[in-house]
Interface confidence: low
């Protein structure tokens, strides 16, 4: 059988512990908040909350100012300080639950754990190309704020989403709280609500609009805020909360809950269940329900496409798509299939599905048995009746009220289960150039950043590094400042280049040089770099061939042999076809004509393995010596390919000359009827890559070959005589005379 | 092609021990979960042991709980069973099965099969 | 233990013949009921998983049917290569499985 070039794994080509190490920031505590400003004018900032501190840092990660924010009654609390004398609540830290950027103001805002969830306002001040904070201002007027009835309690000690809208002058806050019946009972904040803030910032109007978890059910049916943004005209909070209000609460799944971003109202608050399943392709799945789901989200983050992945996804290039990770449960269980995946959800047709789903609810005809849903809001009812109505009145609409879609938007993991054992706590995706990247955070403090691919069955890596060495998760919310996205891990804040740390993990010249233009690689002689890493020799231009392997090791110094090449960058063509003079193979002081390629043996070969092949015919000149030589590949003259063109030499060492000696032969006679077992003994028999034992011209069929003896079994004779023996080794003869004599059968 | 190889079987006195290997090929062996089902001469199936795919959770048949030890190997695409104290009931072909995917409903529905290994078990 | 009981425990059939495998649990089990084909000196072979469903490349002469305590494996037109032992398994109690005793298909 011909052998075969042994396969390198795609990963040969990549070291991802090469040690990167980018500008960071140690906080003092665990990062608990962090958001960027980008101003018009050059400034730009940082902000890092952590327990009872807030850090306003510069581009560079530097520190430019220090706020203190708790604990609440201590006389050091700079932001307690603004809300008038005390005391104002029970004394405690403050942990931040809520960073976010008025943009409007522009203004910081942060809301603690601490005195009743309230919020402070930070005016930004800019100063040079850095930002300072201005005194705060108290977000809570302590005349319109009762236990039942508190405009001004934002903050949920167990975790609260915002997301601020501007609508003409005003700035709405969207506000997504996780509660249970303690929080609910002490200054209620709401599970969902909209609060305009007031113009002289004295706090948040009352009156505002509402949604809340019934009490009845706030011991067991609670809800996580994971995420919330605002794209087109809508905002969107995405949730993990118990899949039924009846059922077991430990059977979770993901919601999307749409609210409109042009009318602070609640009428058309809209959710819809995300399904995100992992399909394994190791077999082809009998099963029904369309591959192991994957309920729980653990980040998203929402962003428009590039070409590639909007192609893939029948969406055009630009959209806006909602990527989410997601894991099998809490608690990770003894799970199969990967720990994360991640699955896309294209944002128009959330809202399409959202639609068909009001359509569905309100339009005749009446679909029987058809919920409205989220009874843990609001009053049970079907459709198309309003909650805890029997019947639709004549002034009221179906549309005014809210409603859970009755069918579940379900998508695929877009990595295909590569992503293994990985578990992603961390995610931000970019489009560069017509590329969409995945930045993703892992929880033993790793980044990984990922082309967002469909159709490969391996991960196109742009990097894959340690943030630092203490392993800590990385944190789930990411920001993005200018050309960096800035992660948290325990208690340092690291800026990441969104083109990658550097180029220094890929190993050869042909990964370097397929690298994605926006990373800006090239080849420095031995390594792969950026240009200010190795300004003398580095070139994005060409690749020398690399040989790593050949076959066979040895040969006749008579004959020729086929000799095949293994290694990388011999074509740049898949179908692997050799311009005329382009490839010089010379063994020891002997050429190697090049072979055309056998298209039936073409074989695909999938490209997280790769290895390239190149036979030639040896036949050693008249001067060649036996013994040990090298095995030299010049390739010369060939067309650039698509990334770079080859140029250069690869010698390997290890092939050996020797001459084959036949020295018996037995038994020297047999029946005419042929079949007898000839053993040739001798030495180097098994060199190279043919032999053929000829009885009177016919070949004995082999049965066995090595070094010092070959087995074969005589053809029929045409009569009873002696005949010519001989054993040719590369179609040249072995020297010796040899005779076989065919007898009476 | 997707594929399970048992070895380790033989002939072993009563109250010895033996060690098989089941060696899996063609699909991504750390994501499934393993078990080992048996067959004495002439009989049905009888389920012996099963393993979670990070070998954290590992379940046996009563006949031969405290007996036998199932572990694996995903680095080395490997599942194993340790049987100790064997006596002359354990005669069995010994298969290794992987499921057909990660639904409750058909976790343990086995469409892979190995060949088997005869363990005989006599004085 | 949920116990599985199998009947016939072997039966003779002639090919082109409609033969029921039927297969009872001790106690409900959903449709968490397998079937299997096994051949001498061969591995048992996947028929039907979760009662009903046909498992890839079998062909669709092959069916079941059932829910809770009682299920059925019927081959609608028995061919030469069908004649085997089937085994009903349970994985309702998994990991702690149990299979049937066995069906034999003889050729009359």
């Known amino acids: 059988e011909d052998w075969q070039c042994p396969r390198t794994p795609y990963a040969a080509s990549r070291d991802f512990d090469v040690k990167y190490v980018v500008p960071s920031f140690s906080a003092g505590g665990l990062v608990q908040a962090m958001v960027t400003y980008e101003g018009d004018r050059n400034e730009s900032a940082v902000f890092v909350a952590i327990r009872n501190r807030l850090h306003v840092l510069g581009p560079d990660l530097k520190s430019v100012q220090s706020l203190a924010t708790g604990p609440a009654g201590d006389p050091g609390c700079q932001t307690c300080a603004a809300c008038g004398p005390g005391p104002h609540g029970p004394p405690g830290d403050t942990d931040t639950k809520v960073l976010v950027l008025d943009p409007a103001l522009p203004a910081l805002v942060s809301c603690g754990s601490s005195l009743q969830g309230r919020c402070f306002l930070h005016d930004l001040e800019p100063q040079g190309t850095a930002v300072h904070l201005a005194a705060p201002a108290c977000l809570f007027s302590a005349h319109h704020n009762r236990p039942d009835d508190c405009p001004d309690c934002v903050a949920s000690p167990l975790g609260t989403r915002v997301t601020v809208v501007e609508q003409g002058q005003a700035s709405y806050f969207y506000v997504a709280s996780s509660l249970d019946a303690a929080v609910a009972a002490s200054f209620s904040p709401r599970s969902v609500s909209i609060r305009r803030l007031k113009a002289d910032a004295s706090g948040f109007a009352p009156g505002f609009v509402a949604l809340s978890v019934l009490p009845k059910h706030l011991v067991s049916y609670s809800i996580e805020y994971v995420h919330s943004f605002h794209t087109g005209a809508f905002v969107y909070f995405l949730t993990v909360q118990p899949a039924s209000v009846t059922d077991d609460p430990s059977a979770l799944h993901t919601r999307l809950a749409r609210l409109s971003a042009t009318e602070p109202e609640l009428g058309d608050y809209r959710e819809l269940v995300l399904d995100c399943r992992f399909a394994p392709k190791r077999r082809r799945r009998g099963a029904p329900e369309g591959g192991q789901p994957y309920p729980v989200l653990r980040v998203a983050h929402s962003a428009p496409v590039g070409a590639q992945l909007a192609t893939e996804l029948s969406i055009a290039e630009g959209q806006e798509v909602l990527f989410g990770v997601f894991v099998t449960g809490k608690d990770g269980g003894p799970g199969v299939g990967p720990n994360s995946v991640v699955c896309a959800f294209p944002i128009d047709l959330l809202d399409t599905l959202i639609d068909e789903g009001v359509e569905r609810c309100c339009e005749s005809p009446v679909h029987p048995g058809l919920r409205r849903g989220l009874d843990f809001f609001q009053s049970p009812s079907f459709c198309p009746n309003p909650p805890g109505l029997e019947a639709l009145s004549p002034n009221t609409s179906c549309r005014h009220f809210p409603l859970l879609v009755s069918s579940s938007f379900s998508r695929v993991d877009l990595f295909n289960g590569l992503l293994g054992p990985v578990q992603v706590t961390a995610l931000y995706v970019t489009r560069l150039d017509n590329v969409t990247v995945a930045h993703m955070g892992t929880m033993d403090g790793r980044i990984l950043q990922v082309e967002l691919v469909r159709s490969l069955n391996y991960l196109l890596y742009v990097s894959n590094f340690s943030l630092g060495d203490s392993g800590q998760p990385v944190q789930r919310d990411v920001s993005r400042l200018g050309d960096h996205l800035l992660f948290a891990s325990g208690d340092q804040v690291f800026q990441v280049p969104i083109q990658g740390p550097g180029c220094r993990h890929f190993l050869t010249c042909g990964r370097c040089l397929r690298a994605w233009h926006f990373m800006g690689c090239g080849w420095c002689g031995n390594m792969c770099g950026q240009q200010k890493e190795c300004p003398g020799s580095w070139q994005q231009d060409h690749c020398p061939p690399k040989l790593t392997e050949f076959h066979p090791h040895s040969g006749p110094l008579r004959g020729s042999t086929r000799l095949t090449l293994c290694g990388s960058n011999f074509y740049l063509h898949p179908s692997g076809l050799v311009p005329e003079g382009t490839h010089q193979v010379t063994v020891g002081q002997s050429p190697c004509r090049p072979l055309p390629k056998d298209s039936s043996k073409l074989r695909p070969v999938p490209r997280k393995d790769f290895v390239e092949e190149f036979e030639c015919e040896l036949e050693p000149l008249g001067t060649q010596a036996v013994g040990p030589t090298n095995v030299s590949l010049t390739v010369t003259n060939m067309p650039p390919g698509k990334h770079f063109r080859v140029d250069g030499t690869s010698v390997l060492r290890g092939f050996s000359f020797m001459e084959p000696v036949l020295i018996a032969v037995q038994p020297l006679f047999g029946p005419r009827a042929g079949g007898t077992c000839l053993t040739l003994e001798g030495q180097s028999l098994s060199v190279g890559t043919s032999r053929a034992v000829l009885v009177n011209g016919t070949e004995c069929l082999l049965a066995r070959v090595s070094e010092g003896q070959l087995l074969c079994a005589t053809p029929p004779g045409a009569t009873v005589a002696s005949v010519p023996l001989s054993l040719q080794v590369g179609g040249a003869q072995v020297p010796g005379s040899w005779t076989f004599q065919y007898r009476e059968d | 092609e997707v594929q399970l190889l048992e070895s380790g079987g033989g002939l072993v006195q009563p109250g010895g021990s033996l060690r098989l290997s089941c060696a899996a090929s063609g699909f991504t062996f750390s994501w499934y979960r393993m078990t080992w089902v048996r067959q004495a001469p002439g009989k049905g199936l009888e389920w012996v042991s099963y393993i979670s795919s990070s070998g954290g959770w590992t379940h046996y048949a009563d006949s031969v709980k405290g007996r036998f030890t199932i572990s694996r190997d995903n680095s080395k695409n490997t599942l194993y069973l340790q049987m100790n104290s064997l006596r002359a009931e354990d005669t069995a072909v010994y298969y290794c099965?992987?499921?057909?995917?990660?639904?409750?409903?058909?976790?343990?529905?086995?469409?892979?099969w190995g060949q088997g290994t005869m363990v005989t078990v006599s004085s | 233990d949920i116990q599985m009981t199998q009947s016939p425990s072997s039966l003779s059939a002639s090919v082109g013949d409609r033969v029921a495998i039927t297969c009872r649990a001790s106690?409900?089990?959903?449709?968490?009921l397998n079937w299997y084909q096994q051949k001498p000196g061969k591995a048992p072979k996947l028929l039907i998983y979760a009662a009903s469903k046909l498992e890839d490349g079998v062909p669709s002469r092959f069916s079941g049917s059932g829910t809770g305590t009682d299920f059925t494996l019927t081959i609608r037109s028995l061919q030469p290569e069908d004649f085997a032992s089937y085994f009903c398994?349970?994985?309702?109690?998994?990991?702690?499985?149990?299979f049937g005793p066995g069906t034999k298909v003889e050729i009359k």
């Open positions: 106690q409900s089990i959903d449709t968490y």
């Open positions: 099965a992987s499921p057909l995917g990660f639904y409750e409903r058909v976790a343990y529905a086995f469409d892979i």
């Open positions: 398994q349970q994985s309702y109690s998994s990991p702690g499985i149990t």
